[in-house]
Interface confidence: low
């Protein structure tokens, strides 16, 4: 499995962002496909669970991402992206996308460095 992500992303506080992750695999996509999204804050701290997919999407039932993340992928297109809603400044950090598609061997984890920025002030 080979992972493709956008690398670095900048988004405005309070908006929504699509964390895009796609993959390649010699094996057909089937029921064994699993996708795990995790988050590590920019200022350090432990890794946090964001999202899990195995045949169906599983959103977090608690924690910082509860009610703020939804599945926006299409495995048939090798797309395992998610949408993160209502961005906050403490969403700054690194998001990882891990795809397993047996019998293909596990590949590298895709990473997205998200920077949440202030709303750009309107200037005449």
């Amino acid at each position: 499995v080979e992972i493709y992500t956008s690398g670095a992303l900048e988004a405005v506080n309070g908006t929504d962002v699509r964390l895009k992750c796609t993959f390649s695999s010699f094996a057909p996509v089937g029921d064994a496909l699993t996708v795990t999204w995790n988050f590590r804050p920019r200022d350090g701290g432990r890794e946090q669970f964001v999202f899990y997919y195995h045949m169906d999407p599983f959103r977090p039932m608690s924690g910082r991402f509860k009610d703020r993340v939804v599945w926006d992928g299409n495995p048939e297109r090798y797309d395992v992206s998610i949408l993160l809603w209502k961005l906050q400044f403490d969403d700054n950090g690194t998001y990882t996308c891990q795809v397993k598609n047996p019998p293909d061997v596990d590949g590298l984890v895709g990473t997205i460095r998200l920077s949440v920025v202030h709303t750009v002030p309107f200037s005449e």
């Epitope: 080979e2 493709y4 796609t22 993959f23 048939e76 090798y78």
Partner: antibody
Framework: EVQLKESGPGLVQPSQSLSITCTVS????????VHWVRQSPGKGLEWLGV???????DYNAAFISRLSISKDNSKSQVFFKMNSLQANDTAIYYC?????????????WGQGTSVTVSS | DIQMTQTTSSLSASLGDRVTISCRAS??????LNWYQQKPDGTVKLLIY???RLHSGVPSRFSGSGSRIDYSLTISNLEQEDFATYFC??????????FGGGTKLEIK
């Protein structure tokens, strides 16, 4: 060896429909999507639509009302049908395989079939 | 829809030259940029996908680079068979897949 081959009518009357078959070999339609792209005389490439391995389709919004794509996995054939053709639909029509990569690239193409819309 | 622009519609070069073909997207496409070669007989081949990854069987004299909205295809040590038309294509925001207008590489 991966191969795709389009077969079409060559000449179509205005207001009539166009049917093209893309026959593939070297891979299974149950594992790969197939795109349709056209190139009008002297112009660039224009994406028309795709049928995915599971049978779902995506179409270019400009053609969604008159385009349908279907397939027969067992015969390794993809079927393209466009209705209400006009002179500006004259083009070379290609089928292409959606690559096994996250970049959604079209990794193998047919040789194209030339279609002229004229009475 | 994302617009793809290849500002140079034709380019002349000699055998052995190094040439660069440019492509610009109307918005950030996150490296989801592919390059295709079309020969005069209409044959189309994928050269590079995801900005810089060489498709299998493509000679190493082809390379791709870029980020955000600006991308380029470089062919080093031009050979006779490289004289063709080159198209870029974005596959970030789908559908539709959109192509640049093409750059025709001609022999000087």
């Amino acid at each position: 060896e991966v191969q795709l081959k389009e077969s079409g009518p060559g000449l179509v009357q205005p207001s009539q429909s166009l049917s093209i078959t893309c026959t593939v070999s070297g891979f299974s339609l149950t594992r790969y999507g197939v795109h349709w792209v056209r190139q009008s005389p002297g112009k660039g490439l224009e994406w028309l639509g795709v049928i995915w391995s599971g049978g779902s389709t995506d179409y270019n919004a400009a053609f969604i009302s008159r385009l349908s794509i279907s397939k027969d996995n067992s015969k390794s054939q993809v079927f393209f049908k466009m209705n209400s053709l006009q002179a500006n639909d004259t083009a070379i029509y290609y089928c292409a395989r959606n690559g096994y990569d996250g970049g959604y690239a079209m990794d193998y193409w047919g040789q194209g079939t030339s279609v002229t819309v004229s009475s | 829809d994302i617009q793809m622009t290849q500002t140079t519609s034709s380019l002349s070069a000699s055998l052995g030259d190094r040439v660069t073909i440019s492509c610009r997207a109307s918005q950030d496409i996150s490296n989801y940029l592919n390059w295709y070669q079309q020969k005069p007989d209409g044959t189309v081949k994928l050269l590079i996908y995801y900005t810089s990854r060489l498709h299998s069987g493509v000679p190493s004299r082809f390379s791709g680079s870029g980020s955000r909205i600006d991308y380029s295809l470089t062919i080093s040590n031009l050979e006779q068979e490289d004289f063709a038309t080159y198209f870029c294509q974005q596959s970030d925001t789908l559908p539709p897949w959109t192509f640049g207008g093409g750059t025709k590489l001609e022999i000087k």
